[in-house]
Interface confidence: low
């Protein structure tokens, strides 16, 4: 199995998709596990509903959710509020009895938050000058500033 890289931004959600042959894996529950070391075991994080027919229902374990489109053959894992410690190797698995087939090996990479809200100065880049216009260019988006929110941090 090749490893597929999924990149997410810290503090945001990351969706990981694992396609599979829906006929081959018909009736099988799925799981998402974290690889412990290069040749270590894969520690279960979350698995789909105990009743295979209800696999489409999202199941959570902490900040990780799993849902399975058994007809279309796509397992989807959502990592909510992604954090640096979430980075690492994972597997999507198809379960049968006590065995597990690997559907996809996944490397999760966590990129820094574009705005570190703990420190307004700790940005990817801190400066905003007059050449940066506070203009909404996408008409479908309208957003009002919250009380006390500064649209652009001042350059220090």
């Amino acid at each position: 199995h090749n490893t597929t890289v999924f990149q997410g931004v810290a503090g945001q959600s990351l969706q990981v998709s694992c396609p599979y042959d829906s006929m081959k894996h018909w009736g099988r529950r799925k799981a998402w596990c974290r690889q412990l070391g290069e040749k270590g075991p894969c520690q279960r994080v979350v698995s789909t509903h105990n009743l295979w027919l209800l696999s489409f229902l999202r199941r959570w374990n902490g900040s990780t959710a799993i849902t399975d489109d058994t007809l279309g053959g796509t397992l989807t894992i959502t990592l909510r509020n992604l954090q640096p410690h979430d980075a690492g190797l994972y597997q999507c698995q198809s379960l049968h009895g006590s065995e597990a087939d690997t559907l996809r090996k996944v490397l999760v990479e966590v990129l820094a938050d574009p705005l570190d809200h703990r420190d307004a100065g700790d940005l990817w880049f801190p400066g905003e000058s007059e050449s940066f216009e506070d203009a909404h260019v996408e008409h479908s988006i309208s957003r009002s500033l919250l009380e006390g929110e500064i649209p652009f941090p001042p350059t220090s």
């Epitope: 990351l14 420190d119 050449s131 940066f132």
Partner: antibody
Framework: EVQLVESGGGLVQPGGSLRLSCAGS????????MSWVRQAPGKGLEWVSV??????????GYNPSVKGRFTISRDNSKNTLYLQMNSLRAEDTAVYYC?????????WGQGTLVTVSS | DIVMTQTPLSLPVTPGEPASISCQSS???????????LNWYLQKPGQSPQLLIY???TRASGVPDRFSGSGSGTDFTLKISRVEAEDVGVYYC?????????FGQGTKVEIK
């Protein structure tokens, strides 16, 4: 794998218009600032424009050299970045790169050549 | 605008030997948060630029450890500990402190 693919370049007369596109894949497009950087033939790099991410209202910024003539935008449903270039001048002749912006321009497209000439 | 000045503009190198490029900014790029907003890029012949170093000294993902960045608020250096043939191209420094982002004029590194 992060990929950026530009298109839309070509030959245009001074005063004319052109719209460049950049299709992004392999990352959550709405989470990232996106930018355009250009390079005149045989010259160095010049930053052109930036558009912020969803969390920051998709606001836009421009280099004073293009402000009022160029407009950056994005269609997030298509994971595509655009640069609308109006009132083009000979000095706008360059390869235009779209780039994802994090700690720096961390991923670049292959570039598309814009030639402004009569 | 912050002006970025690179020296030398051309640098002939010998594979296996070290190389050094300097960059100077017209304003300090040291932010009050302690980070210095200076980046280095390499544009190999016929290719798009690639990010090498950010925050003056942090290597970007996948960049070999023979590349290192150092400096102060206004004077910066990119060092290659042992030049390899694949390192040829034009190196650019860039300030990321304020808009408009500006680049140095580039340093062309070529094998002697």
């Amino acid at each position: 794998e992060v990929q950026l693919v530009e298109s839309g370049g070509g030959l245009v007369q001074p005063g004319g218009s052109l719209r460049l596109s950049c299709a992004g894949s392999g990352f959550t497009f709405t989470d990232f600032y996106m930018s355009w950087v250009r390079q005149a033939p045989g010259k160095g790099l010049e930053w052109v424009s930036v558009i912020r991410n969803k969390a920051n209202g998709y606001t836009a910024g421009y280099n004073p050299s293009v402000k009022g003539r160029f407009t950056i935008s994005r269609d997030n449903s298509k994971n595509t970045l655009y640069l609308q270039m109006n009132s083009l001048r000979a000095e706008d002749t360059a390869v235009y790169y779209c780039a994802r912006l994090t700690y720096g321009f961390d991923y670049w497209g292959q570039g598309t050549l814009v030639t402004v000439s009569s | 605008d912050i002006v970025m000045t690179q020296t030398p503009l051309s640098l002939p190198v010998t594979p296996g030997e070290p190389a050094s490029i300097s960059c100077q900014s017209s304003k300090s790029l040291l932010h009050s948060n302690g980070k210095t907003y200076l980046n280095w890029y390499l544009q190999k012949p016929g290719q798009s630029p690639q990010l090498l170093i950010y925050w003056m000294s942090t290597r970007a993902s996948g960049v070999p450890d023979r590349f290192s960045g150092s400096g102060s608020g206004t004077d910066f250096t990119l060092k290659i500990s042992r030049v390899e043939a694949e390192d040829v191209g034009v190196y650019y420094c860039q300030q990321f402190l304020e808009y408009p982002f500006t680049f140095g004029q580039g340093t062309k590194v070529e094998i002697k």
